[in-house]
Amino acid sequence: DSEEDEEHTIITDTELPPLKLMHSFCAFKADDGPCKAIMKRFFFNIFTRQCEEFIYGGCEGNQNRFESLEECKKMCTRDNANRIIKTTLQQEKPDFCFLEEDPGICRGYITRYFYNNQTKQCERFKYGGCLGNMNNFETLEECKNICEDGPNGFQVDNYGTQLNAVNNSLTPQSTKVPSLFEFHGPSWCLTPADRGLCRANENRFYYNSVIGKCRPFKYSGCGGNENNFTSKQECLRACKKGFIQRISKGGLIKTKRKRKKQRVKIAYEEIFVKNM
């Protein structure tokens, strides 16, 4: 069973910074398209977390394609290391707080929250259910914690820590955002199976977060939510990345990881390991 096909790897805090995509298309696989030209282009590889060269056929493909290495880096990479402390100490908001609301391309419209830079507050918006950008939060509290200026001159960061304006110390904050040493996979993995509104009976899998396993369900063919996968393997890849727990104060993290490099579900929520 592929569910058991896992190995335990010890990762130090400095090895794997958070994968925070500036644009959802940076998570797309390199796509050479159907045409036969040989054109040198660049794409962002979410596994190596670097911009790499690939050969583009000259037509179609996707947005994860750039004329130059510099353009790719500009669109898809950021200085991940120590970014949270840096932005916190400088009392800056993460870059994505300044992005416009983006409903994405899907049509499973749900209520989400974004930071409205014009009004300087978090507001609800109509989200299509996939893609979009990182200025997109499940709860108002999460949006406020990450993007709004906190009280008393605090800037709250997105890992549940805040800078104390009085003594410059980092103090834990009880928030609904993921804590530093827990893994929270894509948010849709926590939603119940939703067969949708149409009349088909397609075999799909959803992640049951209560039992921690992928289970089959019948999908109607439209609507529903993103906890919906065509195979058990795809479901496991997206949702059962395993919990990450703090082993010691030295910051070692134990994580269940797949042996093979496998395609991940494309979405901005795809955040792997969080560390300071």
């Epitope: 609301e101 749900i110 209520t111 009004t119 507050q121 507001e123 609800r124 918006f125 108002l140």
Partner: antibody, heavy 119, light 108 residues
Framework: EVQLVQSGAELKKPGASVKLSCKAS????????MHWVRQAPGQGLEWIGE????????NYNEKFKTRATLTADKSTSTAYMELSSLRSEDTAVYYC????????????WGQGTTVTVSS | EIVLTQSPATLSLSPGERATLSCSAS???????LYWYQQKPGQAPRLWIS???ILASGVPARFSGSGSGTKYTLTISSLEPEDFAVYFC?????????FGQGTKLEIK
């Protein structure tokens, strides 16, 4: 005191259009969503759409997207809803209601405008 | 869209009795996004309960709300004459926002 005052009753023929108004006072018009909800005689409530006047953000119920047009005039703090290609089943009381930008609590409602569609 | 089904359609009770109104959603709705409105004849609806259980300003404590997922309930512990009205549940978790068809609470 927050008030939403709606325009008067309308009698329209099938195929015509109607434009309803909702004048807001007592709060910052641009800082809230304005919703339009209708209620057919003896029926439940049906959400038509919402507009946030400051940036002109609008969300429609797909059912009404092709026939309803929501607009807002910031200078007069008035929201408008135009419904085209009227049919008899559009006969209803149309309400405007405001809600905050963070939730959907429609805490203040207009008095309603009765629209009758009849040949 | 999420369909909200309220039951019963009409509830006939006497003052002093306990009333239980149900609202069932076709798909799961977060409790934060489930509201109730009260409407009396010839009037606009009034916000009554937000976030499943938070009473709006001026709503008496005999009202309470509960539920999660697809099942929600509005309860009135001891009916007063002014409580007789139509109650609508409302969800804003998914677009389009939807209302139940209403439960008419009438005097027996």
């Amino acid at each position: 005191e927050v008030q939403l005052v709606q325009s008067g009753a309308e009698l329209k023929k099938p195929g015509a259009s109607v434009k309803l108004s909702c004048k807001a006072s007592g709060y910052t018009f641009t800082s809230y969503w304005m919703h339009w909800v209708r209620q057919a005689p003896g029926q439940g409530l049906e959400w038509i759409g919402e507009i946030k006047p400051d940036q002109g953000r609008i969300n429609y119920n797909e059912k009404f997207k092709t026939r309803a047009t929501l607009t807002a005039d910031k200078s007069t703090s008035t929201a408008y809803m135009e419904l085209s290609s009227l049919r008899s089943e559009d006969t209803a009381v149309y309400y405007c209601a405001r809600s905050s930008v963070v939730d959907e609590a429609m805490d203040y409602w207009g008095q309603g405008t009765t629209v009758t569609v009849s040949s | 869209e999420i369909v909200l089904t309220q039951s019963p359609a009409t509830l006939s009770l006497s003052p002093g009795e306990r009333a239980t109104l149900s609202c069932s959603a076709s798909s799961s709705v977060s409790s934060s996004y489930l509201y109730w409105y009260q409407q009396k004849p010839g009037q606009a609806p009034r916000l009554w309960i937000s976030g499943t259980s938070i009473l709006a300003s001026g709503v008496p404590a005999r009202f309470s709300g509960s539920g999660s997922g697809t099942k929600y309930t509005l309860t009135i512990s001891s009916l007063e004459p002014e409580d007789f009205a139509v109650y609508f549940c409302h969800q804003w978790s998914h677009y389009p926002f939807t209302f139940g068809q209403g439960t008419k609470l009438e005097i027996k």
